[in-house]
């Protein structure tokens, strides 16, 4: 367990020409606040997946009124850190989204209005317990400067907050195989051993010997999936024996999403999916027009010239969502043919073709037989990016240049002797057998299991295989 901490240093116009207009004015004073969303791993997802590591909202900053004629300065910021607690191990690699929101404090009917000023995102590697990392991100003409760190909550220590520390039992040294806990040299690393048999997938422990279950699992070893169907009472505690989890009040109870947004539970909270024309944490931001630039990732804003007409974002291929905020795996459309490998480069799709295929989508089958000759009357057969020769009788090898030994595979059954012949092979059958490969027994009364032998051949005579 631990806490991710974010310190915003400044938010204001970036360097270079074209400073942005101040977001506030004498007529419309406003104040800023920030939202941070964290996800584990080096996820490419921009805005759509839940903030699986957690999210936090800052306090509101001081009220700011633009000085007429002055360029937009760095805007006044909220006090304090944004803190995102994490319950489990710190993943080491994470993705972040930091949003800067403007709260307008004019005489809006129905309270203040919110609008998204800027959104920055990135992927970073970070060890828990390390120093503050400084960062600068730009969103359009705005620049955000911030620092961040991850720290473990005692008794957890280590770069992933997975090791536990305990006060020393003996004054001089730690127990066998246990190291001192830097920087707490007076404490010792504690072996974190969960209860024997505790499910590694569905259970975890914060104290040695315990087994705590992740959501959706129950039982002493967290091996029993939760079933809500066999529960009788509408509310109540979980039963470890039946595996029945009776839900308590859920984060979506009472639907916290405004303006017709739909609520879905996340491991730590809830997430609102907003109807077109609304966004924000609870779909509370409305009155958005195309002039507010609501379409992300190159989306084109259509309609929405005034607050009463809803805008639509036409999203470039590869993005979806009402604001083009969701990345789509374009390779899932399997654009590369003939087993080509798909690469989504963001601005373009590329196919890496298997041998024998070419073209932007590997749609061209190269002529594998072009310039290839099969010797000794063999014919070339194309396939899978490589040519193959179908050889005439008596020849073999890749290009039919090798003389084949037709007897090498011991084709004559029941002890028949094989002789190579210019037109194939001949089997001399052992007594009692006949057929091209000596495969048929001759009946004791002299009748064959086959129709009568062709004229001029007695059973037992060599049968030539043509």
């Amino acid at each position: 367990a631990g806490v991710f901490e974010l310190q915003i240093h400044s938010f204001g116009p970036g360097p270079g020409p074209g400073a942005p207009r101040s977001p506030c004015s004498a007529r419309l004073p406003c104040r800023l606040f920030f939202r941070v969303c964290l996800k584990p791993g080096l996820s490419e997802e921009a805005a759509e997946s839940p903030c699986a590591l957690g999210a936090a909202l800052s306090a509101r900053g001081p009220v700011y009124t633009e000085q007429p004629g002055a360029p937009a300065p760095d805007l006044p910021l909220p006090d304090g850190l944004l803190q995102v607690p994490f319950r489990d191990a710190w993943p080491g690699t994470f993705s972040f989204i930091i949003e800067t929101w403007r709260e307008e404090l004019g005489d809006q009917i129905g309270g203040p209005a919110w609008s998204l000023l800027a959104r920055v995102a990135g992927r970073r590697r970070l060890a828990a317990g390390g120093p503050w990392a400084r960062d600068i991100q730009r969103a359009g003409a705005w620049e955000l400067r911030f620092s961040y760190r991850a720290r473990c909550e005692p008794p957890a220590v280590g770069t992933a907050c997975t090791r536990l520390c305990r006060p020393r039992s003996a004054p001089s040294r730690c127990g066998p195989g246990l190291r001192p806990c830097a920087p707490l040299e007076d404490e010792c690393e504690a072996p974190l051993v969960c209860r024997a048999g505790c499910s590694p997938e569905h259970g975890f422990c914060e104290q040695p010997g315990e087994c705590r279950c992740l959501e959706g699992w129950t039982g002493p070893l967290c091996t029993v999936p939760v079933s809500t169907s066999s529960c009788l009472s509408p509310r109540g505690p979980s039963s470890a024996t039946t595996g029945c989890l009776v839900p308590g009040p859920g984060p979506c109870d009472g639907n916290p999403c405004a303006n017709g947004g739909s609520c879905s539970e996340t491991p730590r909270s809830f997430e609102c999916t907003c109807p077109r024309g609304f966004y924000g944490l609870r779909c509370e931001v409305s009155g958005v027009t195309c002039a507010d630039g609501p379409c992300f990732n190159g989306g084109l804003c259509v309609g929405g010239a005034d607050p009463d007409s809803a805008y639509i974002c036409h999203c470039p291929p590869g993005f979806q969502g009402s604001n083009c905020e969701k990345r789509v795996d374009r390779c899932s459309l399997q654009p590369c043919r003939n087993g080509g490998l798909c690469l989504d480069l963001g601005h373009a799709l590329r196919c890496r073709c298997r041998a024998g295929f070419a073209g932007p989508r590997c749609e061209h089958d190269l002529d594998d037989c072009a310039g290839r000759a099969c010797a000794n009357g063999g014919t070339c057969v194309e396939g899978g990016g490589a040519h193959r020769c179908s050889c005439a009788l008596g020849f073999g090898g890749r290009d039919c240049r090798e003389r084949a030994d037709p007897c090498a595979a011991r084709p004559c059954a029941h002890g028949g002797r094989c002789y190579a012949h210019f037109s194939g092979l001949v089997c001399a059958c052992a007594p009692g057998y006949m057929g091209a490969r000596c495969e048929f027994p001759v009946h004791p009364d002299g009748a064959s299991a086959l129709p009568a032998a062709p004229p001029g051949l007695r059973p037992g005579d060599p049968q030539r295989y043509l």
Epitope: R21, G140, A141, C290, A291, D292, G293, C295, F296, N297, G298, G299, L300, C301, V302, G303, H314, P316, P317, G318, R330, L333, P335, G346, H347, A348, L349, G359, P360, R361
Partner: antibody, heavy 118, light 108 residues
Amino acid sequence: QVHLQESGPGLVKPSETLSLTCTVSGGSISHYYWTWIRQPPGKGLEWIGYIYYSGITNFSPSLKSRVSISVDSSKNQFSLNLNSVTAADTAVYYCAGISLAGFYFDYWVQGTLVTVSS
Amino acid sequence: EIVLTQSPGTLSLSPGERATLSCRASQSVSRSYLAWYQQKPGQAPRLLIYGASSRATGVPDRFSGSGSGTDFTLTISRLEPEDFAVFYCQQYSISPLTFGGGTKVEIK
């Protein structure tokens, strides 16, 4: 690399329908938005409209009442129809591919001059 | 709709000189969704810059774009003989997609 090839008549009579077709090669038509742009002789560029294989369309408000764009994924083609043409519709007509990263144009055809005259 | 005004209409310069072309929007072009194109006589336009400042594939680094909000600039640091053409800006923030009227860069 995506390549585009335009086809259609170079001369259309007033009040008739201007029809042009653009054939896409070197890429699937389902991976891009496709657009039509025109340029009257000696003048600037004017966007006409675009289409996506899924059926999404968007047109310039000034032409919306007269224009339609369709797509035939099986032939890797998209087409422009502009009805009730007048001499003011005389222009070089370009078909183009819209970028994967935004609604700007990174694949262009050479262009076809369509003259509206009786 | 967003109206894009390009200035100057014509720019007369010599090879080796620096060219600065302006594109001004009637309202803010959000997220710097602005592109620049070059068009030579008898040819289709060619994409130079997107996102106000990102060079398209194969575009020489003497071409650069800058700006945000309502004011955007295309700069050609040192004009080459093949650079003389008409240049258009285009916004792709709000429908309808619109182009500027163009700036002709001609040899002095």
